[in-house]
């Protein structure tokens, strides 16, 4: 139906609520205003996240899922909007908030860092790898001596509590290790990590953090690096790292160090072989490292360098790194 030309009055949504549905995850819900007269027009909603980080977006449905840290609290607003004649009509805002959890800021952990790593899995006959998670943190400066910390991660719909902690000299948990996780190393979901705590003396403030997998995934070094000299040609080959990513998903760097003159050559490539023209009177050490290429996911970390392979003068046969 056509809208009348006279001024349309848009009313704000009602029953706007914020519900925590998981670790670092909230569900925003609201209802159309029952007194809104124009029921048959295409009303939309503008959602504005006020804290902890500003964001806004539009939606036609009356709920929205948000992945966000919650230790600073969470505040959001929603309003009814209508596009009309190239202009935007909008109602006033309806707002709701979650208060920050109790506890002095100095009691929560600091410097929470996490890394994922892909390892061989002896139990799976189809997917021969598994993803482990390792997190470390520092005890809060104002945390009482009897503070104990507990870590949880959420990936997708799975939340798991740490079972393997490392402790400091006072017995406080300062690191966690998950040998097997539900993390998809090729996935795009955020990894949410929460560290909460308890003490007899004061409330320990929880701390949560979101990690992008590409930024924390520690790639394994390339496997089976070999180097061989034939005349003035140094031929280097290797295999892709232990990884869920297929062979075409890797960039490599080869480092060739001339032990005689100290010259360092670093070459970047997408194949798993490299030939360099060299001075056959020298001794060389060769290393290779890998990173997942931007063809397969966002740029991330380089692996450690492989163990050095020594070739050249004083070498009677090529060495192989297993």
């Amino acid at each position: 139906d056509l809208l009348p030309d006279d001024k349309i009055s848009l009313l704000p949504p009602v029953n706007f609520t914020i519900k925590v549905t998981g670790l670092a995850q909230v569900l925003l819900r609201w209802e159309p205003n029952p007194d809104q007269e124009q029921r048959n027009v295409n009303l939309e909603y503008q959602v504005k996240i006020n804290a902890p980080k500003e964001d806004d977006y539009e939606t036609r449905i009356t709920e929205s899922k948000c992945v966000t840290i919650l230790h600073k609290g969470f505040s959001a607003s929603v309003r009814t909007i209508l596009q009309k004649d190239h202009s935007l009509l909008a109602s006033s805002w309806a707002s709701a908030e979650l208060h920050a959890p109790p506890g002095s800021p100095g009691t929560s952990v600091v410097n929470l860092t996490c890394t994922t790593n892909t390892t061989a899995d002896n139990y799976s006959y189809l997917r021969p790898y598994q993803v482990s998670l390792h997190c470390t943190w520092l005890v809060g400066t104002d945390a009482p001596e009897d503070t104990q910390y507990f870590l949880y991660y959420r990936y997708g719909s799975w939340t798991e509590e740490c079972q393997e902690y490392s402790k400091d000299s006072m017995g406080r948990n300062i690191a966690c290790w998950f040998p097997r996780t539900f993390i998809h190393s090729r996935g795009r979901d955020w990894l949410a990590v929460l560290v909460n705590g308890s003490s007899k003396h004061s409330a320990i403030k929880p701390f949560d953090q979101l990690f992008a997998l590409h930024a924390i995934d520690q790639i394994n070094p390339p496997l089976n690096v070999t180097a061989e000299i034939k005349g003035t040609r140094l031929s280097i080959q290797w295999e892709k790292p232990v990884s869920a990513f297929p062979i075409h998903c890797f960039d490599y760097e080869v480092k060739i160090h001339n032990a005689r003159n100290g010259y360092l050559q670093i070459e970047k490539m997408m194949t798993n072989a490299f030939i360099s023209i060299i001075d056959d009177l020298s001794k060389y050490d060769v290393q290779v490292r890998a990173a997942v290429s931007s063809m397969c996911r966002e740029a991330g970390l380089w692996s450690e360098w492989s163990q050095p392979i020594y070739v050249g003068k004083d070498e009677h046969k090529p060495l192989r790194q297993w």
């Epitope: 892909t118 899995d121 139990y123 799976s124 006959y125 189809l126 997917r127 790898y129 598994q130 993803v131 997708g156 719909s157 799975w158 939340t159 798991e160 509590e161 079972q163 097997r180 539900f182 993390i183 998809h184 190393s185 090729r186 996935g187 795009r188 979901d189 869920a244």
Partner: antibody, heavy 121, light 113 residues
Framework: QVTLKESGGGLVQPGGSLRLSCAAS????????MSWVRQAPGKGLEWVSA????????NYADSVKGRFTISRDNAKNTLYLQMNSLRAEDTAVYYC??????????????WGQGTTVTVSS | QAGLTQPPSVSAAPGQRVTISCSGS?????????VHWYQQVPGTAPKLLIF???NRPSGVPDRFSGSKSGTSASLAITGLQAEDEADYYC????????????FGGGTKLTVLR
Amino acid sequence: QVTLKESGGGLVQPGGSLRLSCAASGFTFSNYAMSWVRQAPGKGLEWVSAINSGGKSTNYADSVKGRFTISRDNAKNTLYLQMNSLRAEDTAVYYCADYATNYGVPYFGSWGQGTTVTVSS
Amino acid sequence: QAGLTQPPSVSAAPGQRVTISCSGSRSNIGSGYDVHWYQQVPGTAPKLLIFDDNNRPSGVPDRFSGSKSGTSASLAITGLQAEDEADYYCQSYDSSLSGHVVFGGGTKLTVLR
């Protein structure tokens, strides 16, 4: 060789309860996440629930959330599904299956033969 | 509506090639999530046929292959045989669903006599 064998199905009235079991053998049960998948008569597959290897973390489809509880006893190599407040639409063959994640989208690599649950008055 | 859409039925003669489509959306296949395929012969439990888009478990003939593009996936069967008559299901991960596991509705493959 992986073997999964379900039991505990039967006829139950709407609102009633039933507990399904799945006995596992041929693999290290305590190292695997496990799940239940069901199939209503003449219909497709529907994932119901899953549980992690240690039994401390669980997941449910919206259709059964709050009514069904998945659990496991690693000492007995057994997976369970406690079904309460049963409805006619829960009538199905219930399969026990491993829930293999290992870095990617979970898949169901091994299945039991299924046990039939009929909810009818 | 979240989910994966498959044709209810397909049919072909022995020796022919047949494909079964699995259409998704941005919240599942379109986000790059892996697709798996299962075969269910009437009266038996499902069996994993293809995992991670295009990988076959040992024992699955190379007549079966999977592919994926955009928001859709396909299962191809070449050199069709009578014993391939079964229901076929695709399965993936959907970020909009509770639990995230999603199956297609299934496709009945009939091998014409």
